[in-house]
Amino acid sequence: EDWQCPRTPYAASRDFDVKYVVPSFSAGGLVQAMVTYEGDRNESAVFVAIRNRLHVLGPDLKSVQSLATGPAGDPGCQTCAACGPGPHGPPGDTDTKVLVLDPALPALVSCGSSLQGRCFLHDLEPQGTAVHLAAPACLFSAHHNRPDDCPDCVASPLGTRVTVVEQGQASYFYVASSLDAAVAASFSPRSVSIRRLKADASGFAPGFVALSVLPKHLVSYSIEYVHSFHTGAFVYFLTVQPASVTDDPSALHTRLARLSATEPELGDYRELVLDCRFAPKRRRRGAPEGGQPYPVLRVAHSAPVGAQLATELSIAEGQEVLFGVFVTGKDGGPGVGPNSVVCAFPIDLLDTLIDEGVERCCESPVHPGLRRGLDFFQSPSFCPNPPGLEALSPNTSCRHFPLLVSSSFSRVDLFNGLLGPVQVTALYVTRLDNVTVAHMGTMDGRILQVELVRSLNYLLYVSNFSLGDSGQPVQRDVSRLGDHLLFASGDQVFQVPIQGPGCRHFLTCGRCLRAWHFMGCGWCGNMCGQQKECPGSWQQDHCPPKLTEFHPHSGPLRGSTRLTLCGSNFYLHPSGLVPEGTHQVTVGQSPCRPLPKDSSKLRPVPRKDFVEEFECELEPLGTQAVGPTNVSLTVTNMPPGKHFRVDGTSVLRGFSFMEPVLIAVQPLFGPRAGGTCLTLEGQSLSVGTSRAVLVNGTECLLARVSEGQLLCATPPGATVASVPLSLQVGGAQVPGSWTFQYRED
């Protein structure tokens, strides 16, 4: 019989229900924005905005200061007071729409939904390792701002993204706001603008450059700005917007907008469609060929990548990559594939595709029919003409006007659909050693920390844990402070170590010591933990073998049994080859001689399942007693594996030595031609791994084996005669003298 060890699912080596408690802060209301500051002199802060209030926290998430930012018109509003005696506009709550650092000053800038979306500048005042906010400055000059031209109206109640860039001595605010007809009619915010902060902090310089959705499209064409960032010579905005100005406005797609970070102008504003797909390696029934599109970006983050992922993305280590979590539609509802997919866009490749698109628009010979695009911002035109014009005039350059690059940039899900039902709502990517880790928040309030690698058929988890008991979605914006990430969920801010919250979710020593080095996991007797959690026997260099099962569970007291042991940490080497003298198995008092691995039986084990097998030949000693006993595996002097060496003993109960007894055989005669069905009755006839009924030394083919009965078909006899009949179990004869009589056919 060829018994095989049952597979152990890989998931059995970890427990994602383990509770981790991470430092948190209760903000007293739904967190609307959050940003962190790390100064040159070890001072740091976390700024958390909720409706009508701004909290300043120390690096330990303890409250340092709190500022009333609304309601507008309320005498207690501390930011409103900075604008002098009012009224400044209609009264109402202040929802924070923008919270950014101006690193040049340094200062915090907050902009809310009230007071025409104006901003306030708060100089940072270090006090030891904490930071306080100076009295706010109102970034609004009444005499400069009119409803139709308002350089100081920054934030839209529908959402605004801001990236601050230093150019020379000036700070430029790259602003992108969602608009509709009502918002546009009220103090004219712009869709995309670049505004210079005035040196006296009295507001933003007039005459700023901007693009806005044209009035005729404002009702039907809505742009959501999902993320903005600055890297290299450019500022980028990521948008979700209708794929067409003229077609169904619910058919959305994702675009990357690129602006120069070195010149505060919008002539080189470029857009590129980003296409993310789930293309399963094995296509499921119902899934479209060529991959299922996931057109809607939910969250994004750009980061330099570690060596392994860099190689897989065909770039150099440390190069910047834009990561995006995409869903199938605004509701995020699934099609046939997973709820969320993650695509990676190397920035260098994005930039080249954009630059190439500009050349195609502007080079000669002209490519007929190539549109400049962005018809929601500007008059339609064909390349190389400027918007709204039939031809280039001699003193204008084709390159100095906004352009939608005609090609989209398509990528496939890095996780190959393995996020499954998880709805990702927050993303932050870090490089740890040469590993790239995605820290993801989910719709149900969990944090997933997963290595970003391409095309594996399983997820490499650093951790997967619940932030708290509320189960509220983790919010989109994530901030980093030192070696921690700050996630917001509901009214709470949580501080999560980038190395993971701990190691207790790894249940086996092998899984524990295979964890990434940066996690600092070690084995403490029977659990996985970080050194500070294990004052006793914490170590990172060896694991004992672990027996989980064996077969058979009984064997004959006389004769041999081929014993198969199942478990983990037997070998550490996929070949399962064992150096001489390293593995010692005893069953009761009796040794079990290791058997060489049968290479024909070696099966590739998928990484999602794991099991190791070890075979040995058990020959009981004469002193061995009948009855139950233990199986013990001791491994010593094994050469170390990649992560640890195997060393130690594992003991499992449940093996019994038995004495087979043969009580009756029938019939005792049969034809010489053979084929008589013999029934042998007794006790413990099925013990061990081998048995044979011999009729005159020739094997009687076994048809059925049970504890109390054997059935076999007799072999042909040489002559009519009475011949000896015997039963061997494990190669040893069962006591008793029996004969079988061959008769004429």
Partner: antibody
Framework: EVQLLESGGGLVQPGGSLRLSCAAS????????MSWVRQAPGKGLEWVSS????????TYADSVKGRFTISRDNSKNTLYLQMNSLRAEDTATYYC????????WGQGTLVTVSS | QSVLTQTPSVSVAPGQTARITCEGN??????VHWYQQKPGQAPVVVVF???DRPSRIPERFSGSKSGNTATLTIIRVEAGDEADYYC???????????FGTGTTVTVL
């Protein structure tokens, strides 16, 4: 007028090396992805390698990965392909091509790998 | 790595229509480009981004795409159209450009 001119081909023994060059003119070289494509005698087109303008992203066909290296010098408007550990099956005409559309091609340079 | 399969050869009489197909499991999600290669010459792009045509290519050449099949159509075929034709896509799962197996068009 856009022109791409390959050079550097020739006869080389198995295990040997060659460096191909592609000189570009008539267009702004730096913004474009540039690629090498080869065609064995009597066979179809086979993409070999591509590189972006900064050189920060390079990709290779599995058949040449680890043996060939693509590079470019934007100041000289030139694309290169360093070919090491050449094999008989690398015998082909090697073309350089412009852009993600491969909208312009050179006339090709013949590489023969034979002992 | 993905494969683009083309019909090896198509024969067509002058003035008739030639249709060349290209099948592959990542055509639906990617732009398809078509190239013409005459004996002893370098390839020339005749259709790009599924349906667009460079200005120097006659209007007789057109491209279309349905599901996982792209088609290059040449109407009113002329003797000068006799050549090998290749489709090509970008395979985003491997970061490779992939050419089709090629179709030889013979004008009878």
């Amino acid at each position: 007028e856009v022109q791409l001119l390959e050079s550097g081909g020739g006869l080389v023994q198995p295990g040997g090396s060659l460096r191909l060059s592609c000189a570009a003119s008539g267009f702004t070289f730096s913004p474009y992805i540039m690629s090498w494509v080869r065609q064995a005698p009597g066979k179809g087109l086979e993409w070999v390698s591509s590189i972006v303008s900064s050189g920060g992203w390079t990709t290779y066909a599995d058949s040449v990965k680890g043996r060939f290296t693509i590079s470019r010098d934007n100041s000289k408007n030139t694309l290169y392909l360093q070919m090491n550990s050449l094999r008989a099956e690398d015998t082909a005409t090697y073309y350089c091509a412009r852009g993600r559309l491969f909208d312009y091609w050179g006339q090709g340079t013949l590489v023969t790998v034979s002992s | 790595q993905s494969v683009l399969t083309q019909t090896p050869s198509v024969s067509v009489a002058p003035g008739q229509t030639a249709r060349i197909t290209c099948e592959g499991n990542n055509i639906r999600g990617q732009s398809v480009h078509w190239y013409q290669q005459k004996p002893g010459q370098a390839p020339v792009v005749v259709v790009f981004d599924d349906t667009d045509r460079p200005s120097r290519i006659p209007e007789r050449f057109s491209g279309s795409k349905s599901g996982n099949t792209a088609t290059l159509t040449i109407i009113r075929v002329e003797a000068g159209d006799e050549a090998d034709y290749y489709c090509q896509v970008w395979d985003s799962s491997s970061d490779h450009f992939v050419f089709g197996t090629g179709t030889t068009v013979t004008v009878l």
